[in-house]
Interface confidence: low
C-alpha cells in the first residue's frame, strides 16, 4: 500500500496509524478502530472511516425532486460492522442487540429489529443526490462555471471518474450534484460514489479526512462558494423496506 515514504503517513486518510512495517520496510497504514490495512493512493471506504471516527476520542424547476424511495441518513453515527474489504455488512447491530439492514453507504433501509433480523444482501446505492444551499452572494454563480468546478473537484480531489457525476443543477441558492454508479458500471479501482460523497460531506463541514491538506476552498471564478446547508439523499437499486407505521409517522 502506497503512503508517503519519507514521514510514513496516509495522504488520503488521517484516521490511520502508519509504520514502516510493510514488505521491504515500506510504509503501511492501518485504519483506526479496525486495524485494517488501507490503500493510501485512493479514498478509504466509508465503513472504515465511520469505524475510525467512532474509535476516536469523543470530542419547472431544474432541481431534482428526490424519489419517494430516497433515504436520508437520520440515524447519525454508529459503530459499523465492515467486511474484510471495508464494505458495510448488510446487517448492523448496536450494543443492545437492536439490528437493522443498511445499503452500501451504511444508511438504514429497514425498520429496526432484533438479532433474528435477516439482511440477505447488501443493496447498492446507485444514485446519490447532494443538495447544497450556498450563502448569499452578490449575484448568482454562472451555471456552467459552477458545473465545471464541481466536476473538477470530484475528479481531482476525490478521484471519482467524471462519468459518475451525472449532473449539476443550480437554482440560486440551491445546488444539486447527482452521482450515479450502477453495479455494472463500477470497475475495479473505481472510487465508489458513496465514499466520494462522504469525503465531500466531511470537507463541506470543515472536517477534512485528508492528511495535512488544507480544508476545502471552493471557488467559482475566484468567488468563494460557501455552503450553509447540506442534505444528501440516497437511492438504492432495490427500494427500502419500511413498515407503514414509519411511512405515516
Amino acid at each position: 500500500h502506497t503512503a508517503a515514504q519519507d514521514n510514513c503517513t496516509c495522504p488520503t486518510n488521517k484516521m490511520t496509524v502508519c509504520s514502516p512495517d510493510g514488505p521491504g520496510g515500506r510504509c503501511q497504514c492501518r485504519a483506526l478502530g479496525s486495524g485494517m490495512a488501507v490503500d493510501c493512493s485512493t479514498l478509504t471506504s466509508k465503513c472504515l472511516l465511520l469505524k475510525a471516527r467512532m474509535s476516536a476520542p469523543k470530542n419547472a424547476r431544474t432541481l431534482v425532486r428526490p424519489s419517494e424511495h430516497a433515504l436520508v441518513d437520520n440515524d447519525g453515527l454508529y459503530d459499523p460492522d465492515c467486511d474484510p474489504e471495508g464494505r458495510f455488512k448488510a446487517r448492523q447491530c448496536n450494543q443492545t442487540s437492536v439490528c437493522w439492514c443498511v445499503n452500501s453507504v451504511g444508511v438504514r433501509r429497514t425498520d429496526k429489529g432484533d438479532l433474528s433480523l435477516r439482511c440477505d444482501e447488501l443493496v447498492r446505492t446507485h444514485h446519490i443526490l447532494i443538495d447544497l444551499r450556498h450563502r448569499p452572494t452578490a449575484g448568482a454563480f454562472n451555471h456552467s462555471d459552477l458545473d465545471a468546478e464541481l466536476r473538477r473537484l470530484f475528479r481531482e480531489r476525490y478521484r471519482l471518474h467524471p462519468k459518475f457525476v451525472a449532473a449539476v443543477h443550480y437554482e440560486q441558492p440551491t445546488i444539486q450534484i447527482e452521482l450515479r454508479q450502477n453495479t455494472s458500471q463500477k470497475a475495479a479501482g473505481d472510487v465508489d460514489i458513496g465514499d466520494a460523497a462522504y469525503y465531500f460531506e466531511r470537507d463541506i463541514k470543515g472536517e477534512s479526512l485528508f492528511q495535512g491538506r488544507g480544508g476545502l476552498d471552493l471557488r467559482v471564478r475566484g468567488e468563494p462558494l460557501q455552503v450553509e446547508r447540506t442534505l444528501i439523499y440516497y437511492l438504492d437499486e432495490i427500494p427500502p423496506k419500511f413498515s407503514m407505521k414509519r411511512l405515516t409517522a
Partner: nanobody, 127 residues
Framework: EVQLVESGGGLVQPGGSLRLSCALS????????IGWFRQAPGKEREGVSC????????NYADSVKGRFTISRDNAKNTVYLQMNSLKPEDTGVYYC????????????????????WGQGTQVTVSS
C-alpha cells in the same frame, strides 16, 4: 495469511467431555467475533455458539445450552468450546469461523455470513 485452525476433536463416549480449540492467526483478531458451527453427515451446517470480541457476550443454540461453554483468550489468540454431557446427536465436523465486528459486545448471529472459516475437526460421540 488469515487462518483459523481447529483442534481437540476425537471419539468420546456419551456423557463424556471434549474441549475444542480454535487458533487464530494472520489478522487483527481483536476485532473478530468467533462462532462455532457443526455439520452432521447428510445435514446442513448449524450454529452452535458464538462469542463477542471482548468475550463478554455469548450465544448458544438451544440444543447445547447448559452443556457447552464458549470462551476466548485474546492473549493466546484462541477461542475454546468446552463440551460436556455429550450426546450421539452432537456428532459431526465442528468448524470455527470469524466475523469482523463493529462492537466489542455484540455477538455475531448464528446465521450471519462469517468472513473466515477453519477446516474443521471431527467429533464422534459413540459407545
Amino acid at each position: 495469511e488469515v487462518q483459523l485452525v481447529e483442534s481437540g476433536g476425537g471419539l468420546v463416549q456419551p456423557g463424556g467431555s471434549l474441549r475444542l480449540s480454535c487458533a487464530l492467526s494472520g489478522f487483527t483478531k481483536d476485532y473478530y467475533g468467533i462462532g462455532w458451527f457443526r455439520q452432521a453427515p447428510g445435514k446442513e451446517r448449524e450454529g452452535v455458539s458464538c462469542i463477542s470480541v471482548s468475550g463478554s457476550s455469548t450465544n448458544y443454540a438451544d440444543s447445547v445450552k447448559g452443556r457447552f461453554t464458549i470462551s476466548r483468550d485474546n492473549a493466546k489468540n484462541t477461542v475454546y468450546l468446552q463440551m460436556n454431557s455429550l450426546k450421539p446427536e452432537d456428532t459431526g465436523v465442528y468448524y470455527c469461523a470469524a466475523a469482523f465486528m463493529g462492537s466489542d459486545y455484540v455477538v455475531p448471529e448464528m446465521s450471519r455470513e462469517y468472513d473466515y472459516w477453519g477446516q474443521g475437526t471431527q467429533v464422534t460421540v459413540s459407545s
